[in-house]
């Protein structure tokens, strides 16, 4: 029975050239988190494994930094970074929990954070 919920940073915006932290938090479950995947569409950005720690995909090494915590920091943002990002929590025994974040990278200097929201 999957009882957990994922809270994410929701819809967020950031300035071109800047950086942003993507954060997810799994709650309401006693399931063991074995790995967290960070993905953009179907591209794997990074993995945080309970045994191995962090692995950043080679193609993103220059612009992605692990943390804080199980979050992910995107640096040197471009307009092409606009889009959906997913945190996928692999847990036992529950299985897979997915959180969604939409990032908009703005040309202007007006970049405000959206509200937090939950995905069951």
């Amino acid at each position: 029975m999957m009882t957990g919920t994922i809270e994410t940073t929701g819809n967020i915006s950031a300035e071109k050239g800047g950086s942003i932290i993507l954060q997810c938090h799994l709650s309401s479950t006693t399931a063991q988190v074995t790995q967290v995947n960070w993905e953009q569409q179907d591209q794997l950005l990074a993995i945080c494994n309970a045994d191995l720690g962090w692995h950043i995909s080679p193609s993103f090494k220059d612009r992605v930094a692990p943390g804080p915590g199980l979050g992910l920091t995107l640096q040197s943002l471009t307009v092409n970074d606009t889009g959906e990002y997913f945190c996928i929590y692999h847990t036992y025994p529950d299985g897979t929990y997915t959180g969604r974040i939409f990032l908009e990278v703005l040309e202007s200097s007006v970049a405000e954070h959206g509200a937090r929201f939950q995905i069951p």
Epitope: D42, N49, D51, H55
Partner: antibody, heavy 119, light 107 residues
Framework: EVQLVESGGGLVKPGGSLKLSCTAS????????MSWVRQSPEKRLEWVAE????????YYTDTVTGRFTISRDNAKNTLYLEMSSLRSEDTAMYYC????????????WGQGTSVTVSS | DVQITQSPSYLAASPGETITINCRAS??????LAWYQEKPGKTNKLLIY???TLQTGIPSRFSGSGSGTDFTLTISSLEPEDFAMYYC?????????FGGGTKLEIK
């Protein structure tokens, strides 16, 4: 080339024990979670157990919990499945398989080792 | 446990044809379904994962689709080496479970 070679299967009486091994080569064994999957004589596939890359976490299907123990020796590039209190329904071909780094399915399998539980 | 119903269990086709194999889950498994090929004397091969992502090295004539409870494996322009046993497997929650298999034979 990734290779997984199982061994240790055989004929055993009900209530008996057996230890299967799976020797890995061609990849950094310590970086991957590993699984045991079995195939019944009727060709049904069943996931049996899984172990994390460092061996810290182990998971089992309900029917083998308390009877089977999955373990690994990363220095020897070897995965193990220790089976006790064997039952006739444990008769199957046992495969070791490597879990994808992103955890989405099993990308390499061994050729299997046969276990027969019969009196 | 998530039950996976795979159909058909047997399929006969000719080289060059296009075939589909279906898997239905007893509850939603999001996109997390994998497809495997089993051939005598060879090790099982991962074809598709996460419903539609082609495993590295697998020919593009193999494709997967679906999400939620209903999934399909399509093999277009069948090659002689494609005649084999095919299994689907959900990798959404433990215990991971498999479909009963589809035997694809030459007509």
């Amino acid at each position: 080339e990734v290779q997984l070679v199982e061994s240790g299967g055989g004929l055993v009486k009900p209530g008996g024990s057996l230890k299967l091994s799976c020797t890995a080569s061609g990849f950094t064994f310590s970086s991957y979670a590993m699984s045991w999957v079995r195939q019944s004589p009727e060709k049904r596939l069943e996931w049996v157990a899984e172990i994390s890359s460092g061996g810290s976490y182990t998971y089992y299907t309900d029917t083998v919990t308390g009877r089977f123990t999955i373990s690994r020796d990363n220095a020897k590039n070897t995965l193990y499945l220790e089976m006790s209190s064997l039952r006739s329904e444990d008769t199957a071909m046992y495969y070791c398989a490597r879990k994808r780094r992103d955890y989405y399915g099993m990308d390499y399998w061994g050729q299997g080792t046969s276990v027969t539980v019969s009196s | 446990d998530v039950q996976i119903t795979q159909s058909p269990s047997y399929l006969a086709a000719s080289p060059g044809e296009t075939i589909t194999i279906n898997c239905r889950a007893s509850k939603s498994i999001s996109k997390y379904l994998a497809w495997y090929q089993e051939k005598p004397g060879k090790t099982n091969k991962l074809l598709i994962y996460s419903g539609s992502t082609l495993q590295t090295g697998i020919p593009s004539r193999f494709s997967g689709s679906g999400s939620g409870t209903d999934f399909t494996l399509t093999i277009s322009s069948l090659e002689p080496e494609d005649f084999a046993m095919y299994y689907c497997q959900q990798h959404n929650e433990y215990p991971w479970t498999f479909g009963g298999g589809t035997k694809l034979e030459i007509k």
